[in-house]
Interface confidence: low
Amino acid sequence: EAHQSEIAHRFNDLGEEHFRGLVLVAFSQYLQQCPFEDHVKLVNEVTEFAKGCVADQSAANCEKSLHELLGDKLCTVASLRDKYGEMADCCEKKEPERNECFLQHKDDNPGFGQLVTPEADAMCTAFHENEQRFLGKYLYEIARRHPYFYAPELLYYAEEYKGVFTECCEAADKAACLTPKVDALREKVLASSAKERLKCASLQKFGERAFKAWSVARLSQKFPKAEFAEISKLVTDLAKIHKECCHGDLLECADDRADLAKYICENQDSISTKLKECCGKPVLEKSHCISEVERDELPADLPPLAVDFVEDKEVCKNYQEAKDVFLGTFLYEYSRRHPEYSVSLLLRLAKEYEATLEKCCATDDPPACYAHVFDEFKPLVEEPHNLVKTNCELFEKLGEYGFQNALLVRYTKKVPQVSTPTLVEVSRSLGKVGSKCCTHPEAERLSCAEDYLSVVLNRLCVLHEKTPVSERVTKCCTESLVNRRPCFSALQVDETYVPKEFSAETFTFHADLCTLPEAEKQIKKQSALVELLKHKPKATEEQLKTVMGDFGSFVDKCCAAEDKEACFAEEGPKLVAAAQAALA
């Protein structure tokens, strides 16, 4: 339906609190460098304007689109040219080009560093003094670091953050209560950000069809009792919601997500038996709960897949009449029967099935041609299965840190041109697949691992796209979304790589290393390992083990010394010389 004033419509639907939060997120995701106070001022102005439009929808400018209104407001920022350079040129454009321009300038790696949590008492004082400001600051800090964060979900995490402080600021030992809860929330937020980034990349780089295929597979696994038509409706709505959020239309996105949650809860009987608990919750929690809900049980007596997709004499007729719908039903039927498969694997099987029908339906005897199509799936299923088995065994043998280092070596040898910080970040994330998935029951490992790896490799693709340095990375990232992981897995050592010149600077360490938290200490060591490999790409596992062992001893020795800085200055060059000799 058309509304006289779009901004009034969204304000009424969302309510002031959520409206304010979403506008703050939108501004923070677009203007990532601006101070919090500047954003608060803009949000207040937009909110007051919206209230005016609610009171009188025919008031001046109330008929303008949200992009026009929010874009005009962004373009009033005085420091735009100084802080953002050419992004200021976006303001010369008219909508919709202006919004597209802003989107292109979003920075996936703004370099603000991890959000540091100040001391517990200070946090609780700030929380009690001005709860709204405290939570607004949280939204701002997350949004500017994660410019594609799923906005309505970020509002949910802000509520969870509020809950943590409400509880812990009353506790006897505030820090003991806060630290584990804030850390656990940080992990969830980072995971949520990375997942949404993959959804946005899928929509932006591979189109709506790719996103819908992914969603059909995922929802069919979660809601195997739902009919195909029901799944299709949910997928269409979901595609609209994520297109909006990925496109910066956060108010529409949040409003549509709330509508979808309402629809799902009103139609639980035809979707899933597991939704009752979710549907009693308030809107943000309800949507979050639905997105995380456990899988429903499979309906009894499902016929074998072959009946409709191999044995039916009408296979080619059905396929040629409505290719997307027929392939959609194949993906739906296969996915609901295989909750243990990763979405990526299910999509590869659907692609293989499509390729077989394309080939066979053009022959004289199609049924004979596609009779054994399911046998052609075996290697596609075995490849990720073996990969997960091998890597989980390696993880169990080495532990998380050792497993990360093995992956660092593997990926640096595959794509040595990639920057050291990116290789370290991505390999550390890849290495977390062990503790995240290898501890699962056998039946859940594959889907957990491969779908998690897709999310992590998307991060590599996003970072690499910003500063492309490797044709191999570009190829794996752009050729096929579902084959990204197999593409990276298949990469061998890059024999064309010219080793990096040795630089003593890279291997110079100081006493500040000793006071770093464990994770940051690991990052320093892992960065040194990457640099070592870039200098000596042919180094053997044994040589690397020796050098890294020596490095660990060197750090331990100097951090235990009376005069730490003197020790680093004296022992550092010796270590470098020894390392060069060991790798000669």
């Epitope: 656990a184 608990e277 979710c278 919750k281 709960c289 995380e292 456990e294 503790s435 501890t439 699962h440």
Partner: nanobody, 128 residues
């Protein structure tokens, strides 16, 4: 009401591996966080490891991190504790425990306290 039955405990040498199992029966297993605890002679019962109701998040006491792995098989209503590189100080009676899930999210952490249901225990002895 949930009934829990541990098995798999025995006498092993230091550095050996052992896998403990805990079979659950009764109320729906899927809606419970599961944990392993242990009690050495003359000491208080201590938390070892826990896994949340969906098997997605785990928690370990520092002394067993990297050596022990907790997992669950929802279809078989069983939780496992894979113990590698055992040490004499791991000698204890190991108890399996269950508690109502701590959160609606499958990523909600399992927690170390508030367990309502307990098994009888299984003895693990590690000799040097």
């Amino acid at each position: 009401q949930v009934q829990l039955q541990e098995s798999g405990g025995r006498l092993v040498q230091a550095e050996d591996s052992l896998r403990l199992s805990c079979a659950a029966s009764g109320r729906t297993f899927v809606s419970y966080d599961m944990g392993w605890f242990r009690q050495a002679p003359g000491k208080e019962r201590e938390f070892v490891a826990a896994i949340n109701w969906r098997g997605y998040t785990t928690d370990y006491v520092d002394s067993v991190k990297g050596r022990f792995f907790i997992s669950r098989d929802i279809a078989k209503s069983t939780v496992y504790l894979q113990m590698n590189n055992l040490k004499p100080e791991d000698t204890a009676v190991y108890y399996c425990a269950a508690r109502q899930m701590s959160g609606s999210s499958r990523y909600s952490p399992p927690g170390r306290v508030g367990y309502d249901f307990w098994g009888q225990g299984t003895q693990v002895t590690v000799s040097s």
